[in-house]
Structures are given as C-alpha cells and as structure tokens.
C-alpha cells in the first residue's frame, strides 16, 4: 500500500466571521487560502520493472501525488516528452487510451496512477538503460513529468523503486508569474488575517475552527518540500533509443535540469508484487510547465490548426509524437 501526501480539506468560512470582516473581504481570503493550500508542490513517481520471464519486457508504473484532477497522462521513452522522447501511450481519464508500439497494454490502475506493459520483441523493443517518462497534465497544477529507468546492474524481475523528484523546467517566466501571484495572494491573505486578528470578533463560536488553523497548515512546509533540498539525483543520458520510430528533435533552447529528491515518506510503495530491493533511484526528475489545463473531459480551446495539448517550442506536432492533434 503506498502512502500519498494528503492535502487537508478546507472548512467552509464560519458564519460568525461575516460580521467581523464583511462579506466582501471574507470571500477573497478564503479563495487565496485555498490557492495557498493547494499550491503545494505535486509529485510524479515512476517505477520501471523488467519482467523475469521476458528480459526485454518492461512494465512502467506512474502515479501523480497532487490534489488536482488529472486531465491527461503521456508516457514516453528516450527522454522527456517534448525533449526528444517518443510517445508510447496517452491516457485520458474519461476518453480512454491511445498507445504505440512497443506498448502492449496501457491502463489506469487508480484515478491517479497508470501502468504500461511494453513488448520485448522487435526492433523497437526497449533495453535496460532506456529512460521512461510520465507526464501528468492536471488542473490546477499544470503539467508535471517524471522519468526513471532500471539501474544498470538490476536483475530480471527486480524494479527500481518509485522515484519522485520535483524539478523546475521550461517556461520560467510563466512559472515565476504564477508563483508571484500566489505569493502575493498568500502575503495579502496573511495581512488580512493579521488585521482581522486585531479586530474584536463578535460571537466566535468556540467549537468552530478559527482561520488561524488553516493558515498555519497552509504555510507549514510539507515533508516533501522540506526534503526537496538534499542531494540531487543525476539525469541519465540514454544510449538506447527506439530503433524504428522517428524521434522528435530536442529543444532548440537551453535545457537545464535541477533535480531534487523527495522525502522517502512520500515515496509511494507499490503492492507486494512490486516489492523491490533497495536499488538506488537514478535518472528521476519531475518538471512543471507553464499553463493550466482544462478539467478532464473538457476540450482545450483551439489555437489554430496546429493545437497541441502541451506547450512546446518546436511547433504544433513535435510534442505529440504519434498522437495526431488537430
């Protein structure tokens, strides 16, 4: 059973507060507070397993540890999706699955995790040092990607443990912009709450929770974010590429990676069948990209004939790989 970081549920605003703060100033702090609480860093974990029966057969499992709703999952190999990787499968939480050789069976395991079985025969079959990546588009977090591969000396039947590790990538301006808005909002919220604290609050019912409790919760750094300041993992350069597919060209712009491992308590544990020896995790990273995604099932707005579901500097078709996007 794997443990997931839970975002605490927010209580609705107390009726007694309306007299103290007024209806107008009441709504904004709670909206901002919700943003602050849900602005915690989500994580993506990836687990790669080589089957003991077929040496070149792999099973990839990926999961999303976040409070948002997943709108699309893209599994790729040979590197991150949109950075030279080739799409293996695309999974939509309502509309289904599209998959590509050598993928044999992609499926949803839970509402926030997927698995993909890869065939072990043929020219396009994976090899032991292939990097597999999972990209989760979610609302409101945006797009998060993690990659992983088997350790070089792993025995058949063993798997690399699930390896989440948050990193920043891509559209910095957008990320900083959103972060700035959130930071400003949170500071403003703190200011409002401080101001409210110095005002006499009439008839606050003792049984109810005061807004200070959620505030403390919102601002307390999570284990994950505290732990995300230790030794970085190394990013893999994979020498094993898909043999039969045309791989997308790498990004033209600078590609930089700042990998940060995640606290072990947040490392999801798979079921007994996935139990693995403590192999050091390697080549795992997560990226957040600018742009918020529509709720699952909603059609993204058209931006012209070359719409892609994810932003990509190389043009409309480069990101999607085998998926044809109108």
């Amino acid at each position: 059973m794997r443990t997931e970081a839970q975002v605490p549920a927010l209580q609705p605003p107390e009726p007694g507060l309306e007299g103290a703060m007024g209806h107008r100033t009441l709504v904004l702090p709670w909206v901002l507070l919700t943003l602050c609480v849900t602005a915690g860093t989500p994580e993506v974990w990836v687990q790669v397993r080589m089957e003991a029966t077929e040496l070149s057969s792999f099973t990839i499992r990926c999961g999303f540890l976040g409070s948002g709703s997943i709108s699309l999952v893209t599994v790729s190999w040979g590197g991150p999706n949109g950075a030279g990787g080739t799409t293996l499968a695309v999974l939509h939480p309502e509309r289904g699955i599209r998959q590509w050789a050598p993928a044999r069976q992609a499926r949803w395991e839970t509402q926030s995790s997927i698995s993909l079985i890869l065939e072990g025969s043929g020219a396009s079959s994976p090899c032991a040092n292939t990097t597999f990546c999972c990209k989760f588009a979610s609302f409101p977090e945006g797009s998060w990607e993690a990659c992983g591969s088997l350790p070089p000396s792993s025995d058949p039947g063993l798997s690399a443990p699930p390896t989440p590790a948050p990193i920043l990538r891509a559209d910095l301006a957008g990320i900083l912009g959103v972060s700035g808005v959130l930071l400003f909002g949170c500071v403003y919220l703190l200011h409002l709450l401080r101001r409210h604290k110095h005002r006499p609050a009439p008839r606050l019912q003792p049984s109810r929770t005061s807004p200070q409790a959620p505030r403390a919760r919102a601002w307390a750094p999570s284990q994950a974010s505290q732990a995300a300041l230790h030794v970085p993992y190394a990013t893999i350069n994979t020498s094993c590429r898909p043999a039969t597919l045309d791989t997308a060209h790498p990004h033209g712009g600078p590609s930089w990676w700042a990998s940060l491992p995640t606290h072990a308590a947040h490392r999801p544990q798979g079921p007994a069948a996935w139990a693995s020896t403590p192999i050091p995790a390697r080549g795992s990273f997560v990226s957040v990209e600018n742009g918020l995604y529509a709720q699952a099932g909603e059609r993204p707005p058209h931006t012209g004939p070359g719409l892609t579901l994810f932003p990509d500097p190389r043009g409309p078709r480069a990101m999607e790989g085998p998926l044809g996007v109108r």
Epitope: V90, G96, R98, P305, R317, G321, P322
Partner: antibody, heavy 119, light 107 residues
Framework: EVQLQQSGPELVKPGSSVKISCKAS????????LDWMKQSHGSSLEWIGA????????SYNQKFKGKATLTVDKSSSTAYMELRSLTSEDSAVYYC????????????WGTGTTVTVSS | DIVMTQSQKFMSTSVGDRVSITCKAS??????VDWYQQKSGQSPKALIY???TRHTGVPDRFTGSGSGTDFTLTIDNVQSEDLAEYFC?????????FGGGTKLEIK
Amino acid sequence: EVQLQQSGPELVKPGSSVKISCKASGYTFTDYNLDWMKQSHGSSLEWIGAMSPNNGATSYNQKFKGKATLTVDKSSSTAYMELRSLTSEDSAVYYCARWDSNSWYFDVWGTGTTVTVSS
Amino acid sequence: DIVMTQSQKFMSTSVGDRVSITCKASQIVRTAVDWYQQKSGQSPKALIYSASTRHTGVPDRFTGSGSGTDFTLTIDNVQSEDLAEYFCLQHWNYPYTFGGGTKLEIK
C-alpha cells in the same frame, strides 16, 4: 472537404498478399492518426490498428499482428495496409478512419475497400 | 478484451417514434464510447462521441447517454433516413472493440 478515398475492390488468391490504400485530402495529413477497421460480411466491425503519419508509429490489435502491416507515404498523403497469407476469413470490407485526438473518436471514414479471397 | 454487447440485433419502429438502442460494456469504460451509423452499402459515419457529444452536423434528435458500463443511443422523432445499422465502440482499452450492431427498421 475532408475525404479518405480508398483503393478499389480486390480479388485475390489464398496465400497471397494485398496492399490497399487510403488517400487523404482536405486536411493536413500528418495532423491526424489513421486507423483501420475490418467488417466481415454480415458481422460487426473490428479494429485492426492505428498509424501515425507524423512519425510512422503503429499500434496493432494482437489478433491482426502478423496479418496486417500499416505504412504511410507522407509525400502522397496516403496510408497503406498490407494483408498477407490471405485466407477466406480475410474476405471483408476494410475501412480507414481518421482519429480526432482532441475529441477522441473517428470523425471521418474512408470509402471502404472490398477484399475477396477466392481460388 | 472488452466486450461491447448490443443485445438487440434488430429494432422496428415507425416514423415519428422514439427509439433507444443500448450497448453494454463488459467492464467500466467511463465515457470512452462512441456511436456510429452505417447505412446499407455505405461507410460508417460518426454520430456521438464521448458517450453524449454529437458529432458536427448530426441532428439533435440523436442523443447519447450513459457512462461506466451502460450506454444508450436515443433517436427522437425517427425519420425514414434513420434506417441504418448503429454500432457502439469503446476506446477505453486496447484493443478497441465494437458492439455487434443494431439494425433499425422502419415500419
């Protein structure tokens, strides 16, 4: 107007191979996947596989692996399906269909190609 | 493989009537179900996708509903041009599978 024009009917001998085509027009060929379906006389449809004209990636129904091979010629906006080791079981109408990956469905279907396997 | 069952092979109706064609999936497929119409001697045409969204140009007398395992295509005010065979398709899992089809006959 978006169209998928398929090649004409084929009468072939058992054990031989046949290659049928699906020529796309009215849209950017590489922007959409093309899938293939089989409809045997008096029975339902079966999904054979999918092809990405963009990069040549394929996906097959396990039942048709070794039977069907999907290829593409970007220069002529044409997708092909080759059927080999034909038997009477392969006699059917074969359709190509365009997959709309925004809305996830087959929005346009080809005209269909009738393949008859007979000695 | 996911089995899509259209229990009624044939349905008879009159012009102006309302008819419901059902499709049952052997496992949960969320809303990953489409409906296609095929008139005699023609290629299939898209009617409904994502269980309930009408394809462009499809008359609003065609309505799709359901999610999970049970899906229904309802035709209100049936017209003579609706004489056709109707197929459901699931694309929740590989391989994609079609229902056996329901032929609509006009009395």
